[in-house]
């Protein structure tokens, strides 16, 4: 918090301009009117404020708009957007594509942040759907934001959006989201050969039904244990010992280190002990 201090004589800001970069933090707090800042947000981006000064400006806006900023301010946040927390962004109501474009531009080159994920979430909720205009604006959904969308919103994502997805983009997706994304991925990658297909589909397999896992076992994929652990329990428990053996290939030995943890534990409980014994790994059902 910045202490409340009176603005020194002659320092009261009449507009947002470059002279403010010479103001100390307490002077910015005392001499810049929050309402003035809100109406002239578009100028902030052109001024090389320090991060500390930006903190003060954010604080002033927070005081003026405790329920969340209006879109007229949000659209012109510029680099101040990088100071926002997901909690701040959840208070916003973003409906303009221009606002979304402006803030995504600010974030360009940065790692996909929780802030941007929350922004897209707010935008889609504000619009009520993931419409064609939105997808066009985003150039399809930026893959890093997929997990910030609800399963209902993800159902509008075209299979073409799936091509750019990297494994880390799906790290925060829950099973319900993967249930929606997996069939799209299967469709997107359907014309690839066995090994290439597996490389692409691997990250989405948390949404795969039992039948597809069985089919995958026919292609010598040698699934690693990390991928196996991400499979849905419901899909996994239907697999036989022979099918898991074929699915994991030489990685079958890694089941031993995971036998006390879900989903491996759940799968083991569903198998006949005699079948597990034949694996020769000392696994207990």
């Amino acid at each position: 918090e910045v202490e409340k201090t009176a603005c020194p004589s002659g320092k009261k800001a009449r507009e947002i301009d470059e002279s403010l970069i010479f103001y100390k933090k307490w002077e910015l707090e005392a001499c810049v009117d929050a309402a003035l800042l809100a109406t002239q947000m578009d100028r902030v981006n052109a001024i090389p404020f320090t991060y500390e000064q930006l903190d003060v400006l954010k604080h002033k806006l927070d005081e003026l708009y405790p329920q969340g900023y209006p879109e007229s301010v949000i659209q012109h946040l510029g680099y101040l957007f990088l100071k926002m927390s997901p909690e701040d962004i959840r208070k916003w109501n973003v409906t303009s594509l221009e606002t979304l474009k402006a803030l995504l531009e600010v974030n360009k080159g940065h790692e996909m942040s929780p802030q941007v994920a929350t922004l897209i979430d707010r935008f889609v909720k504000g619009r009520g759907q993931l419409d064609k205009d939105t997808l066009d604006t985003l150039g399809d959904i930026p893959p890093g934001y997929l997990c910030s969308l609800s399963p209902e919103e993800l159902s509008s994502v075209p299979p073409s959006s799936i091509w750019a997805v990297r494994p880390q983009d799906l790290d925060t997706c829950d099973p319900r989201q993967l249930d929606v994304l997996y069939p799209k991925a299967r469709l997107a990658f359907q014309n690839m050969n066995g090994s290439e297909y597996f490389v692409k589909i691997q990250s989405f397999l948390g949404g795969a039904p039992t039948e597809d896992l069985r089919a995958l076992s026919q292609h010598n994929v040698s699934m690693d244990i990390a991928t196996f652990k991400r499979l849905q329990v419901d899909s996994l428990v239907g697999l036989s010992v022979a099918e898991v053996q074929k699915l994991l290939g030489p990685n079958i030995v890694d089941l031993k280190t995971e036998e006390d943890k879900s989903p491996v534990r759940d799968w083991l409980f569903r198998q006949h002990q005699k079948d597990l014994d034949r694996l020769g790994l000392g696994l207990q059902g």
Partner: antibody, heavy 117, light 107 residues
């Protein structure tokens, strides 16, 4: 006890069609991939087709691809093999087999298909 | 396609004999090798899967070994009911293929 009973075999002319059926019992049919394997008179075994448990995926060797179609009706616990453009070399006993991962673990008694003019 | 070659094609043996049948794959199939027994006019029956695992109900006189491309089925003490034709099958790569069979006859 797993039971597989094939039917539908018989004599057919070259170029003709035939549909084989396999009635399954004693296990949860909808949980298993199923296959057809054939054996020409006095010869060895040849895998002909496999279908996934839900019917989404099918697999064939080149020798029958485009001519044979495997299908299933899980509500009736029945597996089918539609054979078109039959040739003399398709003459064989056709076995229905349950397929588990990489193993044909249970087999029916077979049905003879003879392709001859 | 992976070619499976069995040897011998046939053999004559007596009850109580130790019998060995070999199966060679044209490329590495790991341990995805199964053995089946077929008697005249009957359907094949699974004996051994994954090279050495006995299917339920199969007597312990049957055993399997090998890895990669070379595999062996051994009957430690041949019984009258063992006279039959034996087939190996690779389950590593589609299309799944069988050996041409080895007929075990009474000497």
């Amino acid at each position: 006890e797993v039971q597989l009973v094939e039917s539908g075999g018989g004599l057919v002319q070259p170029g003709g069609s035939l549909r084989l059926s396999c009635a399954a019992s004693g296990f949860t049919f909808s949980d298993y991939f199923m296959s057809w394997v054939r054996q020409a008179p006095g010869k060895g075994l040849e895998w002909v087709a496999t279908i996934s448990n839900g019917g989404t995926y099918t697999y064939y060797p080149d020798s029958v691809k485009g001519r044979f179609t495997i299908s299933r009706d899980n509500s009736k616990n029945t597996l089918y093999l539609q054979m078109n453009s039959l040739r003399a070399e398709d003459t064989a006993v056709y076995y229905c087999a349950r397929f588990d991962g990489y193993i044909f673990d249970y087999w029916g008694q077979g049905t003879l298909v003879t392709v001859s003019s | 396609d992976i070619q499976m070659t069995q040897s011998p094609s046939s053999l004559s043996a007596s009850v109580g004999d130790r019998v060995t049948i070999t199966c060679r794959a044209s490329q590495d199939i790991s341990n995805y090798l199964n053995w089946y027994q077929q008697k005249p006019g009957k359907a094949p029956k699974l004996l051994i899967y994954y090279t050495s695992r006995l299917h339920s109900g199969v007597p312990s006189r049957f055993s399997g070994s090998g890895s990669g491309t070379d595999f062996t089925l051994t009957i430690s003490s041949l019984q009258p009911e063992d006279f039959a034709t034996y087939y190996c099958q690779q389950g590593n790569t589609l299309p799944y293929t069988f050996g041409q069979g080895t007929k075990v006859e009474i000497k």
